[in-house]
Structure formats: structure tokens, C-alpha cells
Amino acid sequence: SITTLRPQGSLRDEHHKPTGVPATARPSVAFNIRTSKDPEQEGCNLSLGDSKLLENCGFNMTAKTFFIIHGWTMSGMFESWLHKLVSALQMREKDANVVVVDWLPLAHQLYTDAVNNTRVVGQRVAGMLDWLQEKEEFSLGNVHLIGYSLGAHVAGYAGNFVKGTVGRITGLDPAGPMFEGVDINRRLSPDDADFVDVLHTYTLSFGLSIGIRMPVGHIDIYPNGGDFQPGCGFNDVIGSFAYGTISEMVKCEHERAVHLFVDSLVNQDKPSFAFQCTDSSRFKRGICLSCRKNRCNNIGYNAKKMRKKRNSKMYLKTRAGMPFKVYHYQLKVHMFSYNNSGDTQPTLYITLYGSNADSQNLPLEIVEKIELNATNTFLVYTEEDLGDLLKMRLTWEGVAHSWYNLWNEFRNYLSQPSNPSRELYIRRIRVKSGETQRKVTFCTQDPTKSSISPGQELWFHKCQDGWKMKNKTSPFVNLA
């Protein structure tokens, strides 16, 4: 049970000596500056207090400095994501210092012991930063700590303990167990840096969540709702790994945060955008695709600092692999009436036709129930840029002939024998693009033909007023 993971190693039992550390000559925390573009190359170990070594290692005092902080490890070795992240940072910021914080001896422990070691590792990172600050040209504002899983909380401690304020901390799916609901000073929090941005990719709403569910930064981004990541399903994992195990699925979803961050570094021309929303369910309903008042932002490295007092939860959909970018659309569909609905909800699909490309048949996910004589909002997304939308096709999938559905149809017929057909009346669909913030209204070609039944399709063309755009320029022009 969760209670077995109760926090320990604290003020009351003063485990300040790192727990479970083997008595080897190897330092428990090493700072390895990566100078070579070859990720397999060892790099150069910095030593606190040794200014000569700093020079020999080619440390650039005036440049940006990234500290990459890994998390708990079962293998005791660096995982492949670390090399990818190092390479991506080196490619994007050519003059920057990329430092890997190697705390493998303290992380290759029982999870509870590794958690107890995060504070002391954070203190060591802060100690290194305090020493660097003694050099006149070095600025804490140029420091960006990037922590994955348990490493995100190490970054939090480092930001907490350092004398001054670091420029930025990025938490890549910060660890959940033993951090969920803890005191603000015992976890990554917005107070730990000038800007704290967080990606949550494995936050289960039931049971033990590997990633932290609660927002812990200035902006907290939950790709695909923060739980099930495309390409990490059991079937996907079986296909891409030698053994499709639950642990591979966990790794896939948890590590997705790192790959989304890497994607933001290497695919600058395909930036992903997230939209502020109170919860995942409202986002899935397509309610939250606004960019007004800083309600949208780039994700990953390109995220723009938000000067918000309160934390901001943001959502987006992604592809299953790099580049992760998708194009979000909000559909506002006014359903005038819905005859003989019974208990079953209609299975609706939309196909968008654009100046650049056409979409696939996109399902309209009914999160709750369709409201009649009301505007229903849906979220759809495409993997490619369709360009300007020209027309669209709405399809109502025919009812599958199961005994249950036949019985429902029969019941509906008994209750309203005069009008057995199931029908929806839709005159117009308003579409808003999340990426461009442009709005367009589509009308049925023939105003007299605006009904649709199972197995039928309805075509919509741009209404006479065409594309409507409130802002003359998209806010993403400034964000990108």
C-alpha cells in the first residue's frame, strides 16, 4: 500500500549521511561536463574548489549552463535518454556548458533510500553552484537545471539550497511516490527557480502514480492528459521491445517526458503547443483551445516564462513518436434535435479537408453525453498541417448489429412507433484552430438538408463570411 512509501530520512531521524552507499573510492556525486559531441565520450569531471580544472575542462563562464540530473536507477548505469538529451542540448546551444550530475551510487538503491538521498544530492549541486557564483562572470540566471523523475526533486532541492535564484528548472515527469502532497520545501516547487516548467507523462489517477499528479511548477503540462501516452500501449511495447512487459510500458510513459523535451530541442520547426485548462476532461471536450491572456505556451525547451501568481495546468495531444507535434481543432456543433436517441450515443466522425492536406476520419469523442438543442464542443487533432480548412464531412457510423443494439432499436420503436429513425439536425459547425487561433464557420451545402442518421454523411462548406480571425497575427508567431 501507499503507506509503505511514507517519507523518511528527515529532520526527525537525521539521515544526513547518504543511505546505502557502497564504500568505494568513486565520489557519490560527480559533475561531468560533456565537451565532446560523441555521447559515449567520458567528459571531464569538475571538482568543487578547483578553478584550474574548470579552465582545463573548457567551462565557459558567460554561457548558459545546463545541469542534467538523472533519477532512480535499477541498473546503476546511465540510460540511453541521457545521451540523447546531452546531444540535443549541445546541438541547440553550441556554446553552452552541459553538465551531467552523476549521483548513480546514491540512486542505485532501494527507492526509499534513493528518495532519502535527494536532499543531500541537491545540497551538493547547490554547493557547486555557490562555488561557481564566486567567479565574477558566472550568473545563476544562466543556469537551467533539468531533472528527470527523482532528479526533478533533486533539482528542486538544489534551487532551494543555492544562495540566490537559478534561472530555470525543468521537471521531466517528477517522481510521485513519497512526493505527492508533501510540504512545499520537500519537493520541486515554483519557489525553486525563477521559472519552473514541468512535463507530466505518467500520472495515474488510481493506485501508485510513478509521476507526480499535482502541479509543482509555474506551468505544469500534461501531454495526452498526463496518463496514457500514444505508442506506449501494450501492443506498441510488444512490437518495439524484445519483451513487452509492464515495466517497459511504465518506462515508455515515464520517459516520454524526456523525449518530448528532446523533441522541443531538435524539431524547432515543429513546436508543440499546450493550452491552459482546469482539467483533462474539459480539454478532451475541446473547451480549452484559447491563447488569450497567456493561456497557451510552447512545451519543453521553448516554453515561455509565465508571470503567474498561481500555477497553470496545461494540456495537449501528441503523436506517438518524434516529431510529437499535432494540430488541435475545436469543433462547436449545434445539435438541433436528436430523435429516438435511446440510450446509445451516436458514433460520429469528421473529415477535414484543407488547402495543404486532408485529415483521416477523426472520431468525435463524446466525453459526457450529447446535449440536445445545445452547442456541443469536441476536440479533434491531426498529425499534419492541413492549411486553411475548406470543407468537412460528418459521418454517423452505422449501428453495429449486436443483440443489445437491436433490442434498443426495438424498444425505441415501441416507444415512438410513428418515427423509428434516429436523426440529428446540424446546420453549422464552428471550427477553431488551436495553433493559429483562426476560426471558421461551416454550413451545410443545402440548408434544407441538415439531418443525419446512422450510416449517413453530411457535407459542410465554408459559410459566406469565411475565415474569421480576431487577432491579426497568431500569438504563436511570437511563441515560436
Epitope: 529532520l11 544526513h16 545540497q123 502532497g181 510540504d183 520545501n185 515554483p190 499535482m214
Partner: antibody, heavy 116, light 107 residues
Framework: QVQLVQSGAEVKKPGASVKVSCKAS????????IAWVRQAPGQGLEWMGE????????KYNKKFKGRVTMTRDTSTSTVYMELSSLRSEDTAVYYC?????????WGQGTTVTVSS | DIQMTQSPSSLSASVGDRVTITCKAS??????VAWYQQKPGKSPKLLIY???YRFTGVPSRFSGSGSGTDFTLTISSLQPEDFATYYC?????????FGGGTKVEIK
Amino acid sequence: QVQLVQSGAEVKKPGASVKVSCKASGYTFTTYWIAWVRQAPGQGLEWMGEILPGSAKTKYNKKFKGRVTMTRDTSTSTVYMELSSLRSEDTAVYYCAVYDYGADYWGQGTTVTVSS
Amino acid sequence: DIQMTQSPSSLSASVGDRVTITCKASQDVYTAVAWYQQKPGKSPKLLIYSASYRFTGVPSRFSGSGSGTDFTLTISSLQPEDFATYYCQQHYSIPRTFGGGTKVEIK
């Protein structure tokens, strides 16, 4: 064991300042935040702010910002809370508390009376 | 700032009674809530942290539950030494805020 020992009671005139001390022992002083919480007679608890002794970082309740200053002396493992421009409504018991899981351990409290 | 509203402000109970105190946050604080006990003329004592974890040395009759905005402190069987004032506090964000307190008196 963890102990926080506070300075004695104070009587001050309106407009004056008061400086209350809190001496910590039994744990690594520099590593944990120490908060100041006050309690007016017959009232509830009110968080004023906190300090991390290692880096001297502070977080203040904006209600007291400009009037409250928290400092520390690492050589004696002591934190101080100074409240200026005192008014009668500042009459309260002032507690220091060391934070980890919550306010884990508290000082015995210092009574500050503001009276003309 | 996050407001913490505690209820009731006072209650009378007998030894052996089951007592429930509630605390409502003005916005989501997830499970970042602590409960304290304070006896007259004494400093507060931490009972529960992270909504449901008992602090060291706290008797098992004290339990906490809740998440989001609604939290509960339960004393399963009230003992003579439990007559005191109880406070909730959110430790999700700065400024830390306390509830107004609940005074548990002898019936």
C-alpha cells in the same frame, strides 16, 4: 533530540520594533526551513514567513512584508525575527517552528505585548 | 491566497466518542494538508501531514483523510488528553494558511 528555544517575553510601545530569537539544536541547522507563526490572544495561528538558514533565503507573508525581517546566525544556530512599526494588534505569542513534513517541532513561544 | 475553512469552530464530546473535524480549502491543495493539536498555554504539535500520514509518536486513534479541497481529521475514540484545539494547514503553496481552529471540549 530536536529543540527550539526562544527568547523571553517583551513589552513594547507602538511604533517600536521587537527582535525575537530562536536557538535550534539536535539537527543540521542549515538544512531545514524555520518558520515564524504568531497567535493573538484567543485567536488562531498565522504564518508570518520562514527562513532557510543555509542560504539565508526567506519567504514572507505579504501581509507583513516590509515590517518583518528574518535573519540567522549560523555560528550559534539561531534565527531571528524582527517586527517593526509595532501596533496594538501585534500583541501575540510568536512561535518559531522547524519545517520538514509540516511544522514538525515548535519553540515554546515568546509573548510580545504592544501597549502605550 | 488559499483560504482554509474549518468546521465546526467548537464541539462538545465525551471520552470514547468518535470525533470528526473538517477543513475545506478555497482551491485544490491535492493532499498537501497538515493537522495540529494545541493545548492551552502550549505550542502546537504536528499530528498529521500529507493529509493522511501520522507524525512520529502520534497515537493511531488520530487519522486524516481527503484530497483536493475537502479534508477530515478523525479521532476514533476520544481520550481525556485529546481535549484541545485542532488546526488544519495547507502546505501546498506560499503563503501557508491555517484553518480557524476547532475547539474540542468536554461535554
